[in-house]
């Protein structure tokens, strides 16, 4: 049975086996096509989601689709139902929390009162002044809190208490990539992790431990990637894995927050990387223990210089490392989070690519998560 399952797939009506390598090859090998059913699927970027959250205290902004202008949500008459609608528009199913925060002196958007129409937030037509003088600060999910704060050093062994959102993504029980828990159903990782194996069936997620082999595996229901862009082959290195059963959160299993849409990190901003990847370039072996390291944002202009990536780092990517080199993500860390701490931890990047590991002029290149928020929200909404 084990050998059959490993090398063959059972087609129904009529019952017969096909080689497992024929799964997800684009050809219908089973009469009913079930060999192409449970495969990595691509999902288009989709329409603009008409709500977003700003790094200014997680304040809610709403799009006026007629003009294309964004407005800040006034706290006047804002209700729990409106908060739920806003979060549902972003694909969240959990119970949100919201509060009033004072309109700041730097408020550059017009402030409008919010109403609801066909399960979408709208601006109230006859919106007068914002009498409360407050904006809506909205949190769709409790995220980005860990039991332990890491110390700022070079590279050291990590504890799952510090990084309860880190998962190991495994194919046939072998660690392939890292990933981050975003909510009970969803894990964020890199699309290139699935290039070799596009059948969902053999992929598993392991959460809740800093040791590679020591925790139970979770079944995967769907793997979704963004449509590939043949003009920029290294862009769009992002994937979402939907778990078959929702996670139960605990001290060692928790979600990390998505970044705010306007999360622009300046060069030298401190960030963290974690993973079970190779400890040396071409080092031949994964680390059994989760490792963590502090790095910093490296300016894209510097990263695109002639002695570095020569323009290959696009607007949808970011670079991180340390100027002198030596601290970097490596093979096996792919898909894991590049993290920034403000009030909570945010996954600002996904370990994507780079030339070598730890070179001074070629730091790690990461998928910029804020560039894909719209896509993430559209995937989640489609799966609600």
């Amino acid at each position: 049975k084990v050998i059959l399952d490993k090398y063959y797939f059972l087609c129904g009506q009529p019952l017969h086996f096909i080689p497992r390598k024929q799964l997800c090859d684009g050809e219908l090998d089973c009469p009913l096509g079930e060999d192409e059913e449970h495969c990595v699927k691509s999902f288009p970027e989709g329409p603009a989601v008409a709500v977003r959250l700003s790094k200014d205290r997680s304040t809610l902004q709403v799009l006026d689709s007629a003009t294309g202008n964004w407005f800040s949500a006034c706290f006047d008459n804002f209700t729990e139902a409106l908060a739920e609608t806003a979060c549902r528009q972003m694909g969240y199913s959990s119970k949100p929390t919201f509060r009033a925060v004072e309109i700041g002196p730097d408020q550059d958007l017009d402030v409008v009162e919010i109403t609801e129409n066909s399960q979408e937030l709208r601006m109230r037509n006859s919106s007068g002044p914002c009498l409360s003088g407050s904006l809506v600060s909205l949190h769709c999910l409790a995220c980005g809190k860990s039991l332990k704060t890491p110390r700022v050093v070079g590279v050291e062994e990590a504890s799952v208490d510090s990084w309860p959102w880190q998962v190991s993504i495994q194919y046939d029980k072998q660690h392939v990539c890292g990933g981050s828990i975003l909510d009970p159903h969803w894990v964020l990782t890199a699309a290139h992790c699935f290039r070799k194996h596009t059948d969902v069936f053999n992929w598993k997620v392991r959460a809740g431990s800093d040791k590679l082999g020591s925790f139970p595996s979770l079944a995967v229901a769907k793997i979704i990637i963004i449509e590939f862009n043949p003009m920029y082959p290294k862009d769009n290195d992002i994937a979402l894995m939907k778990l078959q059963f929702p996670l139960t959160f605990s001290g060692t299993v928790r979600p990390i927050c998505l970044p705010f849409f306007d999360e622009e990190l300046t060069p030298a901003t401190p960030l963290w990387i974690i993973g079970w990847g190779f400890t040396k370039q071409n080092g031949g072996k994964m680390s059994d223990i989760l490792l963590q390291a502090s790095v910093q944002v490296i300016d894209s202009t510097r990263c695109n210089a002639d002695d570095a990536y020569q323009g290959e780092v696009t607007e949808k990517m970011m670079c991180a490392g340390i100027p002198e080199g030596g601290v970097d993500t490596c093979q096996g860390d792919s898909g894991g989070p590049l993290m920034y701490q403000s009030d909570q931890w945010h996954v600002v990047g996904i370990v994507s690519w780079g030339y070598g590991c730890g070179g001074p002029s070629t730091p790690g290149v990461y998928t910029k998560v804020s560039a894909y928020l719209n896509w993430i929200y559209n995937v989640w909404k489609a799966e609600l």
Epitope: E45, E227, P230, M231, Y232, P233, G311, T314
Partner: antibody, heavy 116, light 107 residues
Framework: EVQLLESGGGLVKPGGSLRLSCAAS????????MHWVRQAPGKGLEWVSA???????YYPGSVKGRFTISRDDSKNTLYLQMNSLKTEDTAVYYC??????????WGRGTLVTVSS | DIQMTQSPSSLSASVGDRVTITCRAS??????LNWYQQKPGKAPKLLIY???SLQSGVPSRFSGSGSGTDFTLTISSLQPEDFATYYC?????????FGQGTKLEIK
Amino acid sequence: EVQLLESGGGLVKPGGSLRLSCAASGFTFSSSWMHWVRQAPGKGLEWVSAIGTAGDTYYPGSVKGRFTISRDDSKNTLYLQMNSLKTEDTAVYYCARVRLGHFDLWGRGTLVTVSS
Amino acid sequence: DIQMTQSPSSLSASVGDRVTITCRASQSISRYLNWYQQKPGKAPKLLIYAASSLQSGVPSRFSGSGSGTDFTLTISSLQPEDFATYYCQQSYSNPPTFGQGTKLEIK
């Protein structure tokens, strides 16, 4: 000299097949993403297909299932196999190299005429 | 697919004129926009990539600007060799798409 040179165009009947070639020289072909772009007489440019360095292929809906792009890195040559040709496939076919999101190198083109 | 719309479709100008061609995308494409020049019977030639970066060897009288949905190609002082058809192209998402072209003719 860095260049691309297409060949294989000609007159073919609707439903027929044709294979275009594109010979590359003066650059590292094996590490380049290559595309085909076409231009119907007196009309604009239309992307036709792309092939990655690992041989992965991409097509728009208009040609998917009829056209096949391939490459032979040992010969520095790009191919486009066109089957079930329609009159609307009549165009000049260009091969082009992509770098950082733009077509930075183009061939001179080869004319394909589909007519009965 | 993202639609690219150029305006005008054609325009007449004289040597020495300043000319602007615009390109509008059906959705935001950030700065993922390129401009090409094509002369009759020839292959297109890259002028500007990433909205405003001048391709090596292209005269500095050509410049590009814009981001999001609206972009412009400007020729500061038309030269006789600039009379041609100009195309914009987005590389933001699959499939890559081109504008319908702007034919620049001698007045």
